[in-house]
Structures are given as structure tokens and as C-alpha cells.
């Protein structure tokens, strides 16, 4: 080994990664909200729609105060990976009716991937345990009908909206602890 020498700073540090994750999450939340509103305009929802393969909501307002950094980041990454796969599936399986939303769904998928990359980088830099994201619990087969894919889109966007909403709050809270 040679004599001690300093290393130049890399592009970001964990706190900057967390700031970046907050910005990306907020931006993704706004996109999801807008896309969900477009969906409601084009295909009015008759009540709430569920999809068994979607993750259950990780947090409620009451549990925010007890959040720990590892748990939040691990759960958020696993849940977002599930939503990423669901959006992928929706784009592949969507009938002609949803094709009009393809550009928006494509942009949503790309932003989700970017946020997932940022969360993983943050977890690596903090050396937090990184559980391998599971495949969706229920295999995602083709929707039974055109209306089936519309109902699935409502469920996916609604669930993603709620997940991102708690994610923003959780990440902002974690900023104070890092």
C-alpha cells in the first residue's frame, strides 16, 4: 500500500440520498395522484377496488412516531418493488382501453425504478440489512376482461398513492434521525 492519500468526494452522501429520495417520492406521489384522477375521469370507479397481490399498507398515522430507519426503508423498498412489478404487468396486460394511458404508465414505471435505485443506494451506504424483494405473492395472470384491467389499474394506483403518502411522511421523519 502506498502512503495515505485522500479520496475525492463522490456525488452524494447518505443524507443527500435521503433528501433525493424525499424529492423523488413527492414527485412520484404527484404523478400517481394525477394519473389516478385521469383514470377516474375516463373510467369512473364503482367503489373501492382491491387486488390480492398488492402489499398491505405498511403504516398508519399513529405508528409514524415509532418508525425506525431500517424498518421503513426495507418495507418501503419491498412494497415499491411490488408496485413496480404491478405497473409492469399492467402495461403488458392492459387492453385497448388503457393504451391511452401508456405514456403516463411508462413514465410512472421509470420514476419508480429511479426511486428504488436511490433507496437501495441509501441502504447500502448506511449498511442496513437489505432483504431480497419477494415476487408478488399471487402470480399475476392476464386480467379476466377489459373491465378487469381497469379495476386492477384503479387498485394499483390507489394503493401506490397511499404507500407514497406514508413514505413521504416517514422519510421526512427519518431525516431528523440521520
Amino acid at each position: 500500500p502506498g502512503p495515505p492519500a485522500g479520496s475525492p468526494r463522490v456525488s452524494s452522501d447518505p443524507r443527500a440520498d435521503l433528501d433525493s429520495a424525499v424529492l423523488l417520492t413527492r414527485s412520484l406521489l404527484a404523478d400517481t395522484r394525477q394519473l389516478a384522477a385521469q383514470m377516474r375521469d375516463k373510467f369512473p370507479a364503482d367503489g373501492d377496488h382491491n387486488l390480492d397481490s398488492l402489499p398491505t399498507l405498511a403504516m398508519s398515522a399513529g405508528t409514524l412516531g415509532s418508525l425506525q430507519l431500517p424498518g421503513v426503508l426495507t418495507r418501503l423498498r419491498v412494497d415499491l418493488m411490488s408496485y413496480f412489478r404491478h405497473v409492469q404487468w399492467l402495461r403488458r396486460a392492459a387492453g385497448p382501453s388503457l393504451k391511452t394511458l401508456e405514456p403516463e404508465l411508462g413514465a410512472l414505471q421509470a420514476r419508480l425504478e429511479r426511486l428504488l435505485r436511490r433507496l437501495q443506494l441509501l441502504m447500502s451506504r448506511l449498511a442496513l440489512p437489505q432483504a431480497a424483494p419477494d415476487q408478488p405473492a399471487v402470480p399475476l395472470g392476464p386480467p379476466a376482461s377489459a373491465w378487469g384491467s381497469i379495476r386492477a389499474a384503479h387498485a394499483i394506483l390507489g394503493g401506490l398513492h397511499l404507500t407514497l403518502d406514508w413514505a413521504v411522511r416517514g422519510l421526512l421523519l427519518l431525516k431528523t434521525r440521520l
Epitope: V10, P14, S124, L126, P129, Q130, A132
Partner: antibody
Framework: EVQLLESGGGLVQPGGSLRLSCAAS????????MHWVRQAPGKGLEWVAV????????YYADSVKGRFTISRDNSKNTLYLQMNSLRAEDTAVYYC???????WGQGTLVTVSS | QSVLTQPPSASGTPGQRVTISCSGS?????????VHWYQQLPGTAPKLLIY???ERPSGVPDRFSGSKSGTSASLAISGLRSEDEADYYC???????????FGGGTKLTVL
């Protein structure tokens, strides 16, 4: 400028112990997970151990589990590696590294030989 | 034996483009874990070259680029220069080890 400065290496007999230290400066040490990575002479890189930013998580390579202990003191910006029951195959340059790892020290040589 | 597989050597002439591959498994690269690349010049410590599959730290020339697909990744170096002669290592988190794993390294020779 980021600096990681390892110390504590040297010649030790098989079965002996050594404690390596790594002094960090130029970045927020307490915000980074820290690793020890080693490189045997003429060989590739082998990850040894990692400790999370706050010290709550520690993981070890199978080859050192039960013999090596990683720890950190965030108030002193220092990382440690306590190495016990040393074997000839532990001979290597030991690097302290931060983050991904994003930053690496220059390494300290540990030689285990009788 | 390394968990990630790299070719032991690669070579090219100045100005050429060379690619170094890195093959993993379902517990590391294939599990959506990011790949990082390091350059180790003779007699020096490794240096981060590419992180998160394709991002460059500040100061790394854009001649270096990374990509990832499935269970493998690759590092491309275009406009090869004599100072690129070094050992290159890929790395990724491995869920079965709860830590990062490295490739065996590729010695790049500029002819």
C-alpha cells in the same frame, strides 16, 4: 477531502490476535456504514465485515465468523476490527472502506506466520 | 472462488472500446441489487468507478459506463488509454451473505 487511515497491522503468530483501527475524516462518519475488505498478496478483494452507520447491525464473511469482531466509535470517528485466532490464510492487506464502499483507505498489512 | 464471475484478463489497444463482464446469481445481481465497479491501479487502494449500475462518481470520465441485465452486468471503457491499465472488480450486495460480494477481478492490459 475524505481520509481513511488504517493502523494496527503487523506480523503475528498463528493463533494470535491483532486489533486494527481506522481513523476517518473529511466526511460525516456517523452517517456511513463501514466495511473491512482484505486482499491477500496477488489475489482479489474479499469482503470481511460490515457495521451499520449506528452500529446496530454487524455482518461477517463466513471465513471470519466467530473470530473477528467489527465495532465503531462515532464520537471518535474510528472503526475497529478485533482479530482473534489468526490463521496463515488471514494474511492480507486490510482496507477500511465507507459506504457502498465509496471511499477506501490505503490499507494495513497483516502477516500471520510462525 | 469468487461469488461473482469475471474474466481474469482483458486487453485492447489505445482508442479501442473494451467490455468487462460480471456474472452473478439470484441472491445478488439477479435479486435487483445494484452493481458497483472498482478500479485498482497497481500498488494502490481500490477506487469507486461506477455505482448503482451506471452512475459515475464526480471525477470519473464518461469513457467509463456500466450496465446491468438479469443476473449479469458489464463495464465498458471507450477510448482506451494507457492509464486505464489496472484491475477492475465488480461488486453487489448478496442476500444470502448479508454483505457485499466481489468478482475475482479482471486485469486490463493496454497493448
Amino acid at each position: 477531502e475524505v481520509q481513511l487511515l488504517e493502523s494496527g497491522g503487523g506480523l503475528v503468530q498463528p493463533g494470535g490476535s491483532l486489533r486494527l483501527s481506522c481513523a476517518a475524516s473529511g466526511f460525516t462518519f456517523s452517517s456511513y456504514g463501514m466495511h473491512w475488505v482484505r486482499q491477500a498478496p496477488g489475489k482479489g478483494l474479499e469482503w470481511v465485515a460490515v457495521i451499520s452507520y449506528d452500529g446496530s447491525y454487524k455482518y461477517y464473511a463466513d471465513s471470519v465468523k466467530g473470530r473477528f469482531t467489527i465495532s465503531r466509535d462515532n464520537s471518535k470517528n474510528t472503526l475497529y476490527l478485533q482479530m482473534n485466532s489468526l490463521r496463515a490464510e488471514d494474511t492480507a492487506v486490510y482496507y477500511c472502506a465507507a459506504g457502498v464502499p465509496d471511499y477506501w483507505g490505503q490499507g494495513t498489512l497483516v502477516t500471520v506466520s510462525s | 472462488q469468487s461469488v461473482l464471475t469475471q474474466p481474469p484478463s482483458a486487453s485492447g489497444t489505445p482508442g479501442q472500446r473494451v467490455t468487462i463482464s460480471c456474472s452473478g446469481s439470484s441472491s445478488n445481481i439477479g435479486s435487483d441489487y445494484d452493481v458497483h465497479w472498482y478500479q485498482q491501479l497497481p500498488g494502490t487502494a481500490p477506487k469507486l468507478l461506477i455505482y448503482s449500475n451506471n452512475e459515475r462518481p464526480s471525477g470519473v470520465p464518461d469513457r467509463f459506463s456500466g450496465s446491468k441485465s438479469g443476473t449479469s452486468a458489464s463495464l465498458a471503457i471507450s477510448g482506451l488509454r494507457s492509464e486505464d491499465e489496472a484491475d477492475y472488480y465488480c461488486s453487489a450486495w448478496d442476500s444470502s451473505l448479508s454483505g457485499p460480494v466481489f468478482g475475482g477481478g479482471t486485469k486490463l492490459t493496454v497493448l
